[in-house]
């Protein structure tokens, strides 16, 4: 049966012992059965899938990924310095200056770390079977509107670490099966809903570390009805308007961290009713509109850390009943009170600027920081008991 503990304490698993919040998830086995250090990881929902995605991504990026297999090459003759297995072509670091010509039945083409500067019209047109195309770490600065014409089987397209400044609307028109589009670390300065025209099946769109200063005040997901994951980390976006995400009904993860957002329209997130994770950390937000999170009924992770927020309304988080993780690091909450966090009945992780704030969220098992960095554990425990 479940052990009942007083507010501010949590059970040691199935032992009838309770320990204060401070001793849970602090890296020390205080219970004696490690129960206080179990389930401390804060990877809710999509984070797990992100881990899997990156594991896959880096496995694919490794130059040795083809060498372990010995099955024969089925794409005909391949350029010098390229490896081949079955219908997969690995031309990473092959000193290529253009897209190579191989048999049209190739299914994977990895052209990373070459010297490709442009993607000309119809450069991939004959590769109807191609499912994965890796073009990371080239010097691509120009992409023809017809560059990806004919790639009707493509599910994953990697364009990261290039010099692309603009993508002409219609460039992805034929990519009806594309599920992942990764354009990290380029020089994109503007996008529009039409940039993503044709991407009916897109699930993941990563535009981290570009030069975007604003998002369109038009429905961004108009042509990406299945989009689940949208990552704008590390751009220069200044504000979020009310129409931008209006069509992103299926969005589950929205990452806007490390931008320059100083204004949030109070309806910016109104249509994101399936949103599971929202990251607004490290921006310039001073004011949170009172109802900004009102419609985010499914939200389980919210990060607003490291923003110069002046004040948090006491009822700011009232609608977030499913929230499991709340990050408020780097924020001075002058009007902090228990009332702010009490409605968050499912909260398991909270992050503050100061250890002292943890006392205002006594029902949350993992609170960081769990030390003030000066006092001894005994003193901290004593002050909690006194309080």
């Amino acid at each position: 049966q479940d052990v009942s503990c007083p507010l501010g304490s949590f059970p040691c698993g199935n032992m009838s012992r309770c320990l204060p919040q401070l001793l849970h998830c602090n890296g020390v086995d205080d219970c004696g059965n490690r129960a206080d250090e179990d389930h401390c990881g804060d990877n809710n929902g999509w984070s797990l899938q992100l881990d899997k995605y990156f594991a896959n991504y880096y496995k694919l990026a490794s130059t040795n990924s083809f060498e372990a297999e010995t099955s024969e090459c089925l794409v005909g003759s391949v350029p010098m310095h390229c490896l081949c297995r079955d219908l997969e072509l690995d031309c990473d670091e092959a000193n290529l200056r253009a897209v190579p010509s191989v048999s049209s039945n190739v299914t994977v083409m990895s052209l990373q770390r070459n010297f490709i500067r442009t993607l000309p019209p119809n450069g991939f047109r004959k590769y109807h079977e191609l499912q994965k195309l890796c073009l990371q770490n080239n010097r691509i600065h120009s992409v023809s509107v017809s560059a990806f014409r004919g790639l009707r089987s493509l599910t994953k397209l990697y364009l990261s670490h290039n010099r692309i400044t603009f993508l002409k609307p219609g460039v992805f028109e034929d990519l009806h099966r594309l599920e992942w589009l990764i354009i990290e670390d380029n020089h994109l300065s503007r996008i529009s809903p039409l940039t993503f025209y044709g991407l009916n099946s897109l699930i993941l769109l990563v535009l981290m570390n570009n030069a975007l200063t604003r998002l369109p005040d038009k429905p961004l997901c108009q042509h990406m009805p299945r989009l689940h994951w949208l990552d704008f980390e590390g751009n220069r976006i200044h504000n979020l308007r009310n129409l931008t995400f209006i069509s992103c009904n299926n969005l589950t993860v929205l990452v806007m961290r490390k931008n320059k957002i100083n204004y949030l329209n109070e309806h910016a997130f109104t249509h994101l009713q399936k949103l599971d994770e929202l990251d607004l950390g490290s921006n310039k937000i001073e004011n949170l509109p009172p109802n900004i999170f009102k419609d985010l009924k499914e939200l389980s992770q919210l990060n607003i850390s490291y923003n110069p927020i002046q004040k948090i309304e006491v009822n700011q988080f009232d609608c977030l009943a499913k929230l499991k993780s709340l990050s408020l690091e780097g924020i001075e909450i002058s009007n902090i009170q228990q009332r702010m966090f009490r409605p968050l009945i499912n909260l398991s992780h909270i992050y503050f600027k100061k250890f002292q704030y943890c006392g205002y969220a006594p029902h949350v098992r993992s609170c960081k920081p769990n030390t003030d960095g000066i006092s001894s554990l005994e003193n901290l425990l004593a002050s909690i008991i006194q309080r």
């Epitope: 019209p121 034929d174 108009q222």
Partner: antibody, heavy 119, light 111 residues
């Protein structure tokens, strides 16, 4: 099969107005901008403007601003062009055409709607 | 506005020969790697029909005897070998800049 079906020919008096329709079928109406083009008798083609049926955004050729108004009815997949204060200069065949974004071209055209302005 | 000048205004070509139609733009219609010039065919009483898009791409269903070339300000439509059914007026059209503009047309007659 993709089709753009335009309204019947119109004979109207000078100063009057007219509304030309264009019903689309065989494709997702809101996914493609609808363009309108004028062809005066024995002459070349002139681009009037376009409408995005998804959000009703319009863009006009400066020459036709105030003369043409573009609208859509999503429920019937129909685009409309309203022409006002008609003069003999407005007599022409008017075409609607679907704009294919990746091609930057008009790939399907209506059969044309003739408008004759005469007293 | 970008002005497109087509030449010749009309031409007569024998069956099986080559027809060449030129289109000159008053300014470049290139953007980056692409040239935003299209070609249409129009027969009397019919709407225009797309033949070539983005300077050199053949629209599906159009016979391979039609081809487009050029960049910047100078573009060409070639028809070879010309067939009887190719008798029509041909228009070039730029879509690089609003307002989109059309050439004045070239009437092709088959001898």
């Amino acid at each position: 099969e993709i089709q753009l079906q335009q309204s019947r020919p119109e004979l109207v008096r000078p100063g009057a107005s007219v509304k030309v329709s264009c019903q689309a079928s065989g494709y997702a109406f809101t996914n493609y901008n609808m363009y309108w083009v004028k062809q005066s008798h024995g002459k070349s083609l002139e681009w009037i403007g376009y409408i995005d049926p998804y959000n009703d955004d319009t863009t006009y050729n400066q020459k036709f601003k105030g003369k043409a108004t573009l609208t859509v009815d999503k429920s019937s997949s129909t685009a409309y062009m309203h022409l006002n204060s008609l003069t003999s200069e407005d007599s022409a065949v008017f075409y609607c055409a679907r704009f294919r974004l990746g091609y930057y071209a008009m790939d399907y055209w209506g059969q044309g709607a003739s408008v004759t302005v005469s007293s | 506005d970008i002005v497109l000048t087509q030449s010749p205004a009309s031409l007569a070509v024998s069956l099986g020969q080559r027809a060449t139609i030129s289109c000159k733009a008053s300014q470049s219609v290139d953007y980056d790697l692409d040239s935003y010039m299209n070609w249409y065919q129009q027969k009397p009483g019919q709407p225009p029909k797309l033949l070539i898009y983005v300077a050199s791409n053949l629209e599906s269903g159009i016979p391979a005897r039609f081809s487009g070339s050029g960049s910047g300000t100078d573009f060409t439509l070639n028809i070879h070998p010309v067939e009887e059914e190719d008798a029509a007026t041909y228009y070039c059209q730029q879509s690089n800049e609003d307002p989109f503009t059309f050439g004045s047309g070239t009437k092709l007659e088959i001898k």
